[in-house]
Structures are given as structure tokens and as C-alpha cells.
């Protein structure tokens, strides 16, 4: 019997009846066995077929068989109800071998030409299965030339049988206080040949409760207890199960904080599995009662191990544990049923005693000494000599523990000295230098330090003076002996002040004229304002209207008098402002250099002379009354004049203060 080509040679070829294409002889039997490589099959088709037709092809036939199975018995030329001719059909071996048998009987009624067929090996697609047949692979089937292989979805591993996918379902640990776990793929059928282990591991003190939910379907047996697939539940105390069948198991209260669930499946079956909802319980802690003026969050029916609550205080109250304030408070329930922290208190915020207000006082509005949340206090300044700056002085104790003004300021109000108060009322007439009375010139400052000079108090810690008067002490401010609150130059009764710093106008050049003859002295302490010590006001923008030619200003000081000595008592003189051109002309003739009088100066005095400031008055204020505010302000600073004080046709020259308001304000705000 001729054989087909041996593998690994190419498997393909032609078969034909004996004598083809001539007629075949009687009593012929020919057999071909074709063999393909493993994983291949044989394909066969006929290009010519002409055999004697007989009932059930009993006479002449071609028989195709693969292994023990007959694939076809063929005869005739075309198929009938009971006989089959190949026609255009293609035939396939079931495995890798195909047997072809040709037989003719002892006679033919007429000549028949037989057959011609072609065959070839082709790859078997093992992944394609007939309807109703079990799939080749559990999950994924991959065909290749000569064979196939199986693979699994994520979470599965290929069983050693190379076809089944076992679930990777062990080692899952559940640590939450409640949760759900189920058989793989639930509610779809669970995988075969799998062994699953699930652990529930809660903190000591918890007890796990298991509830089977929805459906339960695990392969069972009518007589034997769960021989195929089963579910077991193990705790450190006992084992529950095995479970199988279709009935939901009852709730299991494990009384344990650790549970191991084992699920084992065999190689067959189609069941949906199970689902467990687990919860936990523990010894409850005492129900937390919120402290007065506080509330508990979250509110729960009960609090067990690991549950927590926080306390929040109402606005204006703060958390207090013992004597210490807390930023926040959270207590946690412990396994022995106690809270890990004692309940705090919500204590009313206390702003504490209000700070003292320099030159002012504080009054408790809500009640004597009441400093708690929403309490009100009222600051006020010492009347007459101080006034409150910006603020209305009303402060409320707010929730942050600060006394806060109606504008939201947490800083103290400021009591500013009232400026320009004088006991003196000015007369319209001009008369000779007079002795000052107490309170007439409370801004007057006596400056001793090499020479005698004067100045005027600004606010409660600045002195305005002439640059030439303090030039020598500009680098040694502490050498200046500053006295105020006295009329008598040599009196031991005065208020002493000391200089912290001297600021000389940067435009002043010593010994080169008196332009910019202005300076400020910062005192190292604030002075207490009273009827004898009061600051002078700085001129308002509108002040020039009170300083026109012939308007009366007042100069005061302890300078040289007509007798040629420094005055023992503070003296003052009322003098009119002189026309600027007139003054400029008076100082244009020798010995005065041209341009001695500048726009930064103003002149005052009588054309006839006799009323003037003099040496020792330098730095003192030439003051004017602002009739709108009824306050005195400094218009000039005693600067220079003729060699002979009070000389006719000559005038006292004063630094024009209104030109220097920005300079003064900048120095004071910066320092």
C-alpha cells in the first residue's frame, strides 16, 4: 500500500485510480495512508470522479477514514438520496492521518474513468470548537502552526493541565471594620481548580460578624458532605463549615478579631458561588455628653473601638483641658471601652485685663472687671490735654481673645496731646516785651548746651528749633539739656528732658547764611502734658491767611533784653509780620550779603524798632492764633536779625515753618 510522504517532508500530493485517466479495471483494491505532522490535518478534494453507481456504493467505491471513523463512502458521479459523490466537497482528517481506500468489484456495466484527488497538510485550529463542545481553553486560546496554548486573564494562573485557569485568590487581607468579599467572578460561575484563602484581620478588641448575602450556590452531592467544592470559615476559636449547596448559611458571630475563609473548587461544575458581608462590633464606650457651650461631632447611636468624636465650642468659647487651651479635641474609643482622653471644657474666651492706655484710662462698660467674650470697655484720654486719635475708644472682647475696636483694630488707641492751648488771650495792640505768666507759652522749651537757646514742643516727644542753635550738638545729642514747664530760666523746678537724636535740615549750611534754619530734636521719653507743658500746633494749609503782612505774631524766650542780659523770666513780645520785599530790602545793604532773606524766611518787627527777639531766643517759636480752631500754631522759628536787636529799620528774621511741613512730618513718621 503506497504511503504519503513522511513528515517532516512537505505533505501534499496527488492520488488517482489505477489507469487514470483511462478506465479502471475490475477487482481492484488500492489503499493510501497519508500522515501529517502533529497538530496538522489533511485536506483532500477531488478534481475528477467517475465510479460505478450502486446502492449504498456496494460495488465500486472510494472510502475516506480517519482513525476508526469513516468520513465518507463515495461512488457514482453525482450524489443521490442514498449515495454520495464528492462533487466540490473538501474532506478533512480528524487527526493527523487519513486513509483512502479504492475498490472495484468483478464487473462494470460500462467503462468508468475513476478519480483524481489532491491532498495537502494544513494546521488544525484547535481553538475552534463545534457548538455544544467544551472549549479548548478556560479563558484564552491561542492557535499556532502545529498546535495551540492557553492563557488566563489577570488574577488567574494556568493549571498544570495547561487548559484550566485557577484563580489567584489567596492572601487577600481585609482590615476595614466592615466590608464585602465573594467567590471569584461572583455572581458569574466561579473558576475551577482553585483554592482561595481570604483573611479578615481587625485590631484586637473587635469581633467579626459574617452574613451570607444575595445568593449561595456551591457544587454539592446528595449523599456526601461537600465532596467537590466547599467553603470553610476558621477562627482562633473554632471552624465553621464546610458549606456547599444552594442554601444561604446563617449569620456567624465569630467572637474573634481574625477570620480565615477558605474556598476550594474542583475541575468541573458551573455554579455562581457566594457573597459575604462582614461587620464588626466591640465593647462600646460611654456616650459622650458635650460640655456646656460645646457640641459633639459626629453624633452616633453608639461609639465602639476606634470610633472617635470631636468637641467644638460655640463662638466665644475655647477648648480647655485642665489649665491648658487646646487647638482641637478628638477622643478615640479604646478596646477596654474607655475613651483615651477626658472630656474638655468649653471655657468662655477671656481677653484679660485691658492694657493701660498712656495718658488715658479705661472703663469697664459691661461690668466691673468683666473681660470675657463680648465684654465692652471704653478707653478715653485725659481731658483737656489729650485727644483720641482716629478711634472712638470702644473695644469689645472678641472670640480670638483680643480687645478689638469697632474698626477691627487690635492695637491700643492713641492719646495725642492737644496742641496750641494757652492761658493767654491776645490783644490787638502792640506793646513792649512783657513777662509771661504760667500757661501762656506752655510749648516753650529751654535748650542748654554750650549756649542758651529755645525750642517749641511738638506732640509729646519732639522739639522744633533752629538748626544754628543745636548744630554743634548734632553728633552728641545727649549733651543737650532740655527743660520745660518753667518760666524762670534759673529755677530748679522744671521738667527735664533729654535728647535721643538731633535732625538738622539737610539744606542748612552752618556759617553760610540761615536758609533752612530748622531742626528737630527727638526726646528719649514722652513728656506728660499739662497746663504748663503743651505742644504747639503745626500750621494748617490754610494758616497763611493768619500770617499776612501786619498780622500779629508772638515771640517768646529768655534771650537778651534791652539791658543786655539774658532774661530771668520768660518774656514775650507781640510783633507784626513785615512785608517780604520790605524786609529783603532792609537786609540788602552792607554788612549783609545780597540774598540774605530767602523765600524760606519771614520777617516780623516794628519799623521803629524796639520790639524784637534777640540772642538767646534762637530756636523759639513765633506763634499765631488760628481764629478758626482757636489754637496757637508755630509760624516762624527765631533765626537771625540785625547785630543790634530791635534796631529801627531792621527786623527779626524767622524760618518760615509752613515751607517745612513735609520735612517735619517725614522725620516724625520715620523716627
Amino acid at each position: 500500500t503506497p504511503l504519503g510522504p513522511k513528515w517532516p517532508e512537505p505533505v501534499f500530493g496527488r492520488l488517482a485510480s489505477p489507469g487514470f485517466p483511462g478506465e479502471y479495471a475490475n477487482d481492484q483494491e488500492r489503499r493510501w495512508t497519508l500522515t501529517a505532522p502533529p497538530g496538522y490535518r489533511l485536506r483532500l478534494y477531488f478534481t475528477h470522479f467517475d465510479l460505478e453507481l450502486s446502492h449504498l456504493c456496494e460495488y465500486d467505491f472510494v472510502k475516506l477514514s480517519s482513525g476508526a471513523k469513516v468520513l465518507a463512502t463515495l461512488c457514482g458521479q453525482e450524489s443521490t438520496d442514498t449515495e454520495r459523490a464528492p462533487g466540490k466537497d473538501t474532506f478533512y482528517s480528524l487527526g493527523s492521518s487519513l486513509d483512502i481506500t479504492f475498490r472495484s468489484d468483478y464487473s462494470n456495466e460500462k467503462p468508468f474513468t475513476g478519480f483524481e484527488a489532491f491532498y495537502a497538510a494544513e494546521d488544525i485550529d484547535e481553538c475552534q470548537v463545534a457548538p455544544g463542545e467544551a472549549p479548548t481553553c478556560d479563558h484564552h486560546c491561542h492557535n499556532h502552526l502545529g498546535g495551540f496554548y492557553c492563557s488566563c486573564r489577570a488574577g488567574y494562573v494556568l493549571h498544570r493541565n495547561k487548559r484550566t485557569c485557577s484563580a489567584l485568590c489567596s492572601g487577600q487581607v481585609f482590615t476595614q471594620r466592615s466590608g464585602e468579599l465573594s467567590s471569584p467572578e461572583y455572581p458569574r460561575p466561579y473558576p475551577k481548580l482553585s483554592s482561595c484563602t481570604y483573611s479578615i484581620s481587625l485590631e484586637e478588641g473587635f469581633s467579626v460578624i459574617l452574613d451570607f448575602v444575595e445568593s449561595f450556590d456551591v457544587e454539592t452531592h446528595p449523599e456526601t458532605l461537600c465532596p467537590y467544592d466547599f467553603l470553610k470559615i476558621q477562627t482562633d476559636r473554632e471552624e465553621h463549615g464546610p458549606f456547599c449547596g444552594k442554601t444561604l448559611p446563617h449569620r456567624i458571630e465569630t467572637k474573634s478579631n481574625t477570620v480565615t475563609i477558605t474556598f476550594v473548587t474542583d475541575e468541573s461544575g458551573d455554579h455562581t458561588g457566594w457573597k459575604i458581608h462582614y461587620t464588626s462590633t466591640a465593647q462600646p464606650c460611654p456616650y459622650p455628653m458635650a460640655p456646656p457651650n460645646g457640641h459633639v461631632s459626629p453624633v452616633q447611636a453608639k461609639y465602639i473601638l476606634k470610633d472617635s468624636f470631636s468637641i467644638f465650642c460655640e463662638t466665644g468659647y475655647e477648648l480647655l483641658q485642665g489649665h491648658l487651651p487646646l487647638k482641637s479635641f478628638t477622643a478615640v474609643c479604646q478596646k477596654d471601652g474607655s475613651w483615651d482622653r477626658p472630656m474638655p471644657a468649653c471655657s468662655i474666651v477671656d481677653c484679660g485685663p485691658p492694657d493701660d492706655l498712656p495718658s488715658g484710662r479705661v472703663e469697664y462698660i459691661t461690668g466691673p472687671g468683666v473681660t470675657t467674650y463680648k465684654a465692652v470697655i471704653q478707653y478715653s484720654c485725659e481731658e483737656t490735654f489729650y485727644t483720641m486719635k482716629v478711634n472712638d475708644g470702644k473695644y469689645v472682647c472678641e472670640a480670638d481673645g483680643f480687645w478689638t475696636s469697632s474698626k477691627g483694630e487690635k492695637s491700643l488707641p492713641v492719646c495725642e496731646p492737644v496742641c496750641g492751648l494757652s492761658a493767654r488771650t491776645t490783644g490787638g495792640r502792640i506793646y513792649g516785651g512783657q513777662k509771661a505768666k504760667p500757661g501762656d507759652f506752655p510749648w516753650q522749651v529751654l535748650i542748654l548746651g554750650g549756649t542758651t537757646a529755645a525750642g517749641a514742643l511738638l506732640y509729646d516727644n519732639w522739639v522744633l528749633t533752629a538748626a544754628h542753635a543745636v548744630y554743634e550738638q548734632k553728633h552728641d545729642a545727649s549733651a543737650l539739656d532740655i527743660r520745660m514747664g518753667t518760666l524762670k530760666r534759673l529755677s530748679p523746678h522744671y521738667t527735664q528732658a533729654w535728647s535721643e537724636a538731633v535732625f538738622i535740615h539737610e539744606g542748612y549750611t552752618h556759617d553760610a547764611g540761615f536758609d533752612n534754619d530748622i531742626a528737630l530734636i527727638k526726646l528719649n521719653n514722652k513728656v506728660v502734658i499739662n497746663s504748663n507743658i503743651t505742644p504747639i500746633c503745626l500750621p494748617r494749609k490754610e494758616a497763611e491767611s493768619f500770617m499776612r503782612t501786619d498780622d500779629i505774631g508772638t515771640a517768646s524766650g529768655w534771650g537778651l533784653t534791652q539791658r543786655g542780659f539774658l532774661a530771668r523770666n520768660l518774656m514775650y513780645v507781640d510783633i507784626p509780620i513785615v512785608d517780604h520785599q520790605k524786609c529783603t530790602a532792609a537786609y540788602e545793604k552792607p554788612p549783609y550779603p545780597r540774598g540774605s532773606v530767602t523765600a524760606n524766611m519771614l520777617c516780623a518787627g516794628l519799623e521803629s524798632g524796639g520790639k524784637d527777639s534777640c540772642r538767646g531766643d534762637s530756636g523759639g517759636a513765633l506763634v499765631f492764633l488760628d481764629s478758626e480752631t482757636e489754637r496757637w500754631f508755630v509760624g516762624g522759628i527765631v533765626s537771625w536779625g540785625s547785630m543790634n536787636c530791635g534796631e529801627a529799620g531792621q527786623y527779626g528774621v524767622y524760618t518760615k515753618v509752613i515751607n517745612y511741613i513735609p520735612w517735619i512730618e517725614n522725620i516724625i513718621s520715620d523716627f
Epitope: 489649665h323 491648658l324 487651651p325 487647638k327 471655657s347 477671656d350 481677653c351 484679660g352 481673645g401
Partner: antibody, heavy 122, light 106 residues
């Protein structure tokens, strides 16, 4: 204005008891608003809280010193005191008394004494 | 008991900003306090309850506390700010101080 002033011996022998007193002026120690504390500072080192007392006698101590420390209060004299037993050279320090507020703005040491130097040496 | 960790030193030029940190486990859950101490003087409270400034303390001193770190910031540092700075907190009614940070104004 409240002021605090420490007083006591500047030299203490090893193993003896250090005793200091803090006198409060300008305010009452019995005011319920404050705690009164002791803090020390070894030479060239940082601050260490020793303990605090309330006018009622409630005390709080540093756990590391608790076995050796006693703080007491004498409201009639407006004073509070520190006793530190079994001293060693490691207890050489400047000892400060200080006030901490009990109400809002509480618990910070807002007023301090000028400190007193205690040397432990034989 | 808490341990508060501060850098030993911080240098800053005049007018610049100095930041001093204080670290401790969950310090942000507690209140932080800051004290300034100049040589030979007693400490002075500059910040209490994380961010609050006692009266008389300049606005250039500010505080912040969150997570594990509290910070004292001195903006526009002046020569007079040169000092040792200590952080402090209360842990279960026990006062705890940091080791201190020396601020040098260059």
C-alpha cells in the same frame, strides 16, 4: 504692672536641697487668671520648664524632674516657692520664675523674673 | 513627651526676612509659643498660640504652625532682633522648650 523677683541662696552643695522663692508685686497671686511657673537655663544652654502651680495649690511638674521637685504657694505673702532635692552639678543654672495666663491668651509665659543664678558646688 | 527641634543658628542681613523653624511630632495639633532672649536678659514672649502677638511686639514678628513644623518669621529684620529664640509647646500639661536658635544680623 506685675513684677516677679526670685530670691534664694546662690550656692548649694551637692545632694542638698535647692530652695528658691518668687515674690509677686503689683498684683495678687490669688487672682484666678494665672499660673505661676519655674523655668531654668543651664549656662550656655536652652530653657527647661520645671513646673507650674495655681493659687489653689494644683501643680504640674516636668516628668524628668518630678521625683525631686516641690512647688508650693503662700498666698498670704504673695509668694510661690521651688524646692529641688538631691542636687548635682547638672542643676547649676539661672532659675527664672514666670507667670502664665490661665484665660484666653493663656499658657504663654508673659512675665518673667530677672532670674537668679544657682551654682551647685562643694 | 514631645521633642522640639530648632536649627542652632540663622543668619540674616538687615532688612531681610529671617525664618526660624521648630519641628515636633504633630506639633500643628498643639499651640506653639516663641520667646526672644537677649544676652544677660530674661526671655520675652513674642508669639503665643501659633500666630498671636502680645501688645508691644512689633508687627514684623509673625508665626505659623501646621503639620509637624512651627515657624517664626521676622520680616525687615533689625539689628535689635539679634537674640536667641526659643519655641515652646504644652504636651499633656508638660511644658516643652526647643533648644533655641541664635539669630545673627550680619
Amino acid at each position: 504692672q506685675v513684677q516677679l523677683q526670685e530670691s534664694g541662696p546662690g550656692l548649694v552643695k551637692p545632694s542638698e536641697t535647692l530652695s528658691l522663692t518668687c515674690t509677686v508685686s503689683g498684683g495678687s497671686i490669688s487672682s484666678g487668671e494665672y499660673f505661676w511657673g519655674w523655668i531654668r537655663q543651664p549656662p550656655g544652654k536652652g530653657l527647661e520648664w520645671i513646673g507650674s502651680i495655681y493659687y489653689s495649690g494644683s501643680t504640674y511638674y516636668n516628668p524628668s524632674l518630678k521625683s525631686r521637685v516641690t512647688i508650693s504657694v503662700d498666698t498670704s505673702k504673695n509668694q510661690f516657692s521651688l524646692k529641688l532635692s538631691s542636687v548635682t552639678a547638672a542643676d547649676t543654672a539661672v532659675y527664672y520664675c514666670a507667670r502664665s495666663l490661665k484665660a484666653a491668651r493663656r499658657d504663654a509665659f508673659d512675665i518673667w523674673g530677672q532670674g537668679t543664678t544657682v551654682t551647685v558646688s562643694s | 513627651q514631645s521633642v522640639l527641634t530648632q536649627p542652632p543658628s540663622v543668619s540674616v542681613s538687615p532688612g531681610q526676612t529671617a525664618s526660624i523653624t521648630c519641628s515636633g511630632h504633630k506639633l500643628g495639633d498643639k499651640y506653639a509659643y516663641w520667646y526672644q532672649q537677649k544676652p544677660g536678659q530674661s526671655p520675652v514672649l513674642v508669639i503665643y498660640q501659633d500666630t498671636k502677638r502680645p501688645s508691644g511686639i512689633p508687627e514684623r514678628f509673625s508665626g505659623f504652625n501646621s503639620g509637624n513644623t512651627a515657624t517664626l518669621t521676622i520680616s525687615g529684620t533689625q539689628a535689635t532682633d539679634e537674640a536667641d529664640y526659643y519655641c515652646q509647646t504644652w504636651d499633656s500639661s508638660t511644658g516643652v522648650f526647643g533648644a533655641g536658635t541664635k539669630v545673627t544680623v550680619l
